[in-house]
Interface confidence: medium
């Protein structure tokens, strides 16, 4: 059982990807804190020479959907929708391999950004993955 909340996204940083859709938050005040973190991360990303175009085109919306997951509207209790594991793995191991290595070894980035761990996501063919968020 989850004990979080579903609330409309009210932020700026991810508005172009999420709009005013309902997102899952673990606490009522968490959205503002995460918004500040992702804004700082995006400021860093925007000026970073370490981020390739190939990576950025999927990494930026992925980070938004990871930070502010859509609520699972098929669930009777507030529950987040996961990123799709196959896309997460392509991002980490192919499109953004160099960037992930750099980010995971850079404490300044890790302070601002919680990167998704693909191994925590449900397997592609499992029932839990049926409603995953595709980028």
């Amino acid at each position: 059982e989850e004990d979080g909340f579903c609330q409309p996204y009210r932020g700026i940083a991810c508005a172009r990807f999420i709009g005013n859709r309902t997102v899952y938050m673990e606490s009522l005040h968490m959205q503002g804190e995460i918004e500040n973190q992702i804004t700082a991360a995006f400021t860093m990303i925007g000026t970073s020479s370490h981020l390739s175009d190939k990576c950025s085109q999927f990494a930026i919306p992925s980070l938004c959907h990871y930070a502010f997951p859509y609520c699972d509207e098929t669930s009777s209790v507030p529950k987040p929708r996961d990123l799709c594991r196959d896309e997460c793995e392509i991002l980490e191991n192919v499109l953004c391999q160099t960037e992930y290595i750099f980010a995971r070894s850079n404490p300044m980035i890790l302070m601002r950004l919680k990167l998704p761990n693909c191994e925590d996501l449900p397997q592609p063919e499992s029932p839990e993955a049926a409603n995953c968020i595709r980028i």
């Epitope: 172009r16 930026i60 919306p61």
Partner: antibody, heavy 121, light 107 residues
Framework: EVQLVESGGGLVQPGGSLRLSCAAS????????IHWVRQAPGKGLEWVAW????????YYADSVKGRFTISADTSKNTAYLQMNSLRAEDTAVYYC??????????????WGQGTLVTVSS | DIQMTQSPSSLSASVGDRVTITCRAS??????VAWYQQKPGKAPKLLIY???SLYSGVPSRFSGSRSGTDFTLTISSLQPEDFATYYC?????????FGQGTKVEIK
């Protein structure tokens, strides 16, 4: 060199349709927000729509919502604006423009030369 | 929707003059404001982004500033090639909005 080239403008009757194209080159098309902005004769700039080609995230101005559709073909590095149910007030030069920053929210640094759409009977 | 109210709508100035154009946002847009220059029959050109950052290749006589929801474009010493129409734009929200424009004419 970054370039955006619009095409597809012309004269169309009220209620008619037109599809504008914006061919991009010199940058990774799928990594940047692409905008359509229009300018009626003798008037100011009006933002119309944008697309994030990777994943096809889109957004529209209220004045065109439901009538215009923005799309992109990443294999051709081209953005499109399909305009249906055209009205006289849609008469304008239509520009496509690229957002400067890959993250978005940064201003439009490269613009096409514009293509004129005239809606008249 | 956020409105950007630009003033004046037009102004006459001489070469060498200091010119100031103002834009007021109807609500907070942080520093997410850009300024563009447009000449007749041409596409707009980006001058300033993030309220005060000078875009690459733009002469240093152009500058931008912010005070709350008021944004200012200043041309410190007007040059002949600066006679044009100038627009502000907010991009804080997905629906980006432009000011009405300020036409800078020769006195």
């Amino acid at each position: 060199e970054v370039q955006l080239v619009e095409s597809g403008g012309g004269l169309v009757q009220p209620g008619g349709s037109l599809r504008l194209s914006c061919a991009a080159s010199g940058f990774t098309f799928s990594s940047y927000f692409i905008h359509w902005v229009r300018q009626a004769p003798g008037k100011g700039l009006e933002w119309v729509a944008w697309i994030y080609p990777s994943g096809s995230y889109t957004y529209y101005a209220d004045s065109v919502k439901g009538r215009f559709t923005i799309s992109a073909d990443t294999s051709k590095n081209t953005a499109y604006l399909q305009m249906n149910s055209l009205r006289a007030e849609d008469t304008a030069v239509y520009y496509c423009a690229r957002e400067m920053d890959r993250v978005g929210y940064s201003g439009m640094d490269y613009w096409g030369q514009g293509t004129l759409v005239t809606v008249s009977s | 929707d956020i409105q950007m109210t630009q003033s004046p709508s037009s102004l006459s100035a001489s070469v060498g003059d200091r010119v100031t154009i103002t834009c007021r946002a109807s609500q907070s847009v942080s520093s997410a404001v850009a300024w563009y220059q447009q000449k007749p029959g041409k596409a707009p050109k980006l001058l300033i982004y993030s309220a005060s950052s000078l875009y690459s290749g733009v002469p240093s006589r152009f500058s931008g500033s912010r005070s709350g929801t008021d944004f200012t474009l200043t041309i410190s010493s007007l040059q002949p090639e600066d006679f044009a129409t100038y627009y502000c734009q907010q991009y804080r929200t997905p629906l980006g909005t432009f000011g009405q424009g300020t036409k800078v004419e020769i006195k």
